[in-house]
Interface confidence: low
Amino acid sequence: KSSNEATNITPKHNMKAFLDELKAENIKKFLYNFTQIPHLAGTEQNFQLAKQIQSQWKEFGLDSVELAHYDVLLSYPNKTHPNYISIINEDGNEIFNTSLFEPPPPGYENVSDIVPPFSAFSPQGMPEGDLVYVNYARTEDFFKLERDMKINCSGKIVIARYGKVFRGNKVKNAQLAGAKGVILYSDPADYFAPGVKSYPDGWNLPGGGVQRGNILNLNGAGDPLTPGYPANEYAYRRGIAEAVGLPSIPVHPIGYYDAQKLLEKMGGSAPPDSSWRGSLKVPYNVGPGFTGNFSTQKVKMHIHSTNEVTRIYNVIGTLRGAVEPDRYVILGGHRDSWVFGGIDPQSGAAVVHEIVRSFGTLKKEGWRPRRTILFASWDAEEFGLLGSTEWAEENSRLLQERGVAYINADSSIEGNYTLRVDCTPLMYSLVHNLTKELKSPDEGFEGKSLYESWTKKSPSPEFSGMPRISKLGSGNDFEVFFQRLGIASGRARYTKNWETNKFSGYPLYHSVYETYELVEKFYDPMFKYHLTVAQVRGGMVFELANSIVLPFDCRDYAVVLRKYADKIYSISMKHPQEMKTYSVSFDSLFSAVKNFTEIASKFSERLQDFDKSNPIVLRMMNDQLMFLERAFIDPLGLPDRPFYRHVIYAPSSHNKYAGESFPGIYDALFDIESKVDPSKAWGEVKRQIYVAAFTVQAAAETLSEVA
């Protein structure tokens, strides 16, 4: 059968039919349904939601919907022995204690099983000592403290404000600095937007609100006890001492009311500059310890959380492809939440649900996609991307041979200003073309395309007339597919105006106040931004699964490779003397990029001209496109990060959320001037240039004519 016969409707009509079937009212209804009680990973409530979604996806018309379960390490507070932080006087008496829970939002006062704020996977402990304020606890903050201010964090409890970087990196940095405990808090400077009221009267964080979250440094490992392999019934589990990524010091999060009580007494050094000051009426002194009057008082942490092997459940739905059933396009997002999940994840899960419903409607009318579409509702994302990673580990052989693309679907909104897209360069043209076909939901852009409003509000820093598309980092379920397996990946959501809102993420992130009402009252009352995100995510999946030639443009990879090579070269050129001394050359990398550019250009010409009615040639060309992302995978992985195997992109070693280009070279160059053995350090730079150049050249050759 030709592809058009198989899919039964003309391709243009298919896409329009699919998009027209998506309804804002349904997304709203699904969001309400998913947010009435907490769905914490490993709980009965989340298992019940998994079964509900399985049942509804079957009703919607998918060919099969299965639960895939794993037994992974999770972390919970002790219900009878709560976590808190005290100020103690010289007699050891607790003269101040932090709150044990967040005041519940209106209408939720009688909801049970709201997990109190905690840092997942914190070890137990009751350290006491002087406090040191470490700003955001970034690498550069500790450099400032230790190198410039000569402040030693060894044996101290550090207090860090949330924001800028992933919390796990903060904890790792504190550990490396010798701290014996970490207090994380939300400063109003980062989580309280000026001119907006606190929840429930607005979308700002109240003083008693607290951000939950895991503090692991997994580096893509998945379940800490079974790195590289699925946590199935016959798994061999590591002992807790050998588990991957667990923190070694107690950690606990607090809100800004409680933070004020700790910070207002701080003495010692003044903050080094204004970038260390938040918005509380406290001096932001660095410490160590409290001021004169309070100098005998100490801070004591009381952490009693436990790590437990617990069963989690993914829901995997299949819509079999009519022509290429062995080619998989995956749409996945998580289901587990810290509490109600009003934004994270259920604003995403509701969109996935509506996308499944629309695809199911088309299928019931006799249509099938060209390629197989897999839909996933992941569990335990909040505990370290565990559900997606375990499933990918279990199915890695299939995925690396058959995986065309992965589209992520966590939170659909983090604001209501404009679109935000992070994806592989292979998808740039797909995203551009799709957004030109969609209507903008933005006020002032009636009748204009989404591409137009997006480009106006978020212009590309390099190319005029084009929108910004960012690198993929991590901190979400695409990680295993992209960074480990090399499957082309992308994500899209509506975001805030980064120019005017300098706070980190959205204020109520991972708090009890992330409710349905937050979304319905303040972010998207008409659910028009949710609908737009559904159209973008669903449209990408539709095109990836249905277009005859895969909608990947390898020339866009060539463009960014040159940009990344220029960037890393300029970083290295900050050390011209050492480059000369150790004969460091980037010639091989620039040569490989040039070759890639030429070969990609020739491949694109052949792609225009080949006989698309010849199924063998069509499959061959599509396979070259599908396997291009795979060609950037180094089977040995990055140094000390074996599950980050993509040579062009990896999560930053200093911030899991951010993507870094040529990460092997970047990390080898980072802080190289402080290395004790410069010869060895520059040798590693040269090795990383070699690995990168080889990989780019090898990837280029996969696009060459096959014989």
Partner: nanobody, 126 residues
Framework: QVQLVESGGGVVQPGRSLRLSCAAS????????MGWVRQAPGKEREFVAA????????LVSDSVKGRFTISRDNSKNTLYLQMNSLRAEDTAVYYC???????????????????WGQGTQVTVSS
């Protein structure tokens, strides 16, 4: 809005006890701290005691320390002040106050922007 209604005041002999109650109604969500402030005839308002919503932090003024205890029943949205060993100088109108304390304020400071009850008279006299 939040409504606060005090009860339990009265005339009592020195050395005896009284228990004041303050029932909160209306939009009580977001109330972070509740407390008692008193005003004796011809004098300024004086802070007596305060408690955070979680009950984890309480503060009692030095003038009543060891004699007065503040507590709160969240399920009933009620604040209590147990006053033992009463003295003549405890005679005053006792006001219940509640605050959703914006950041940057000392937690037990009550001011005009907070919620106040009408007050209940306590007279200690032989």
């Amino acid at each position: 809005q939040v409504q606060l209604v005090e009860s339990g005041g009265g005339v009592v002999q020195p050395g005896r006890s009284l228990r004041l109650s303050c029932a909160a109604s209306g939009r009580t969500f977001g109330i972070y701290v509740m407390g008692w402030v008193r005003q004796a005839p011809g004098k300024e308002r004086e802070f007596v005691a305060a408690i955070e919503w979680s009950g984890s932090n309480r503060l009692v003024s030095d003038s009543v320390k060891g004699r007065f205890t503040i507590s709160r029943d969240n399920s009933k949205n009620t604040l209590y002040l147990q006053m033992n060993s009463l003295r003549a100088e405890d005679t005053a109108v006792y006001y219940c106050a509640a605050s959703n304390r914006l950041y940057g304020r000392t937690w037990y400071d009550f001011n005009e922007s907070d919620y106040w009850g009408q007050g209940t008279q306590v007279t200690v006299s032989s």
